[in-house]
């Protein structure tokens, strides 16, 4: 039996400067080449060693690229997305979605999961912090009596 797989989804703007050998990553996806089931988005499949993306350090394999220089990547054919990157110029601004996988319950396979699920630690950490603050405040209050 597998535990539920949750994701912490964050977005980031990444500005890359094209290096001598380009931007330095591979992509998969597109309307004609779905990489993630029911999602025709464009995903980073490989970061090339010593390339511009690797040296910058923020772009990760598995990231979804939402836009390039403000141009949305929704509903694009794979080759059209490739061409968009290749013609993006020297300074390239990427809007990227990172998905940090959080495993709840027994360890299972890495599935597509529910990207909108709230990881349990997102609930437990604030509750624990509030408990600690309340305990500290109570102790201080007792000392004053």
């Amino acid at each position: 039996m597998n535990g539920r797989v949750d994701y912490l989804v964050t977005e980031e703007e990444i500005n890359l400067t094209r290096g001598p050998s380009g931007l330095g990553f591979n992509i998969v996806g597109g309307t004609d080449q779905q990489y993630v089931s029911n999602d025709s988005g464009i995903y980073v499949s490989r970061i090339k060693e010593n390339g511009a993306a690797a040296l910058d350090g923020r772009l990760q394999e598995g990231d979804k690229i939402l836009s390039v220089n403000g141009q949305d990547l929704k509903n694009l054919l794979h080759q059209d997305a490739v061409d968009l990157f290749r013609n993006a110029g020297y300074a390239v601004s990427l809007r990227v979605q990172h998905r940090l996988q959080v495993q709840n319950g027994p360890i299972g396979h890495r599935g597509e999961g529910d990207p909108s699920g709230i990881p349990i630690f997102m609930v437990l950490v604030p509750v624990f912090a509030l408990t600690m603050v309340a305990a500290w405040a109570f102790m201080r209050y007792r000392q004053q009596l």
Partner: nanobody, 127 residues
Framework: HVQLVESGGRLVQAGGSLRLSCAAS????????MGWFRQAPGKEREFTAH????????NYADSVKGRFTISRDNAKNTVYLQMNSLKPEDTAVYYC?????????????????????WGQGTQVTVS
């Protein structure tokens, strides 16, 4: 992880033909870009041919253009290199290589550093 196994290499006479095969397993084949490289004794590994995920885009080293043809069968998870009008200088170990996805950079297909997965190679000898 991707495993690549080449086959089809053998001794052939000059002017003859051969078809090399590379069977891939371990990951969705349709997302892999594939290349053939070769390495002659005492020389560096050199680019021979490349095919993209769909088979819609191919390119070749100048030395094999018009003689070699790269193709793929996504239903069989296999890429082929049809070699015609073979010359003694085509003698080499031929390696199949794969990388996940398309590079967003131009002219990267010929760079061996652009590939993550490699087969063990198959020997082609042209006498």
């Amino acid at each position: 992880h991707v495993q690549l196994v080449e086959s089809g290499g053998r001794l052939v006479q000059a002017g003859g033909s051969l078809r090399l095969s590379c069977a891939a397993s371990g990951r969705t084949f349709t997302h892999l870009n594939m290349g053939w490289f070769r390495q002659a004794p005492g020389k560096e590994r050199e680019f021979t041919a490349h095919i993209n995920w769909s088979g819609g885009s191919t390119n070749y080293a100048d030395s094999v253009k018009g003689r070699f043809t790269i193709s793929r069968d996504n239903a069989k998870n296999t890429v082929y290199l049809q070699m015609n009008s073979l010359k003694p200088e085509d003698t080499a170990v031929y390696y199949c290589a794969a990388t996940l996805g398309d590079s967003v950079d131009l002219d990267s297909d010929a760079d061996p550093r652009g590939y993550d997965y490699w087969g063990q190679g198959t020997q082609v000898t042209v006498s």
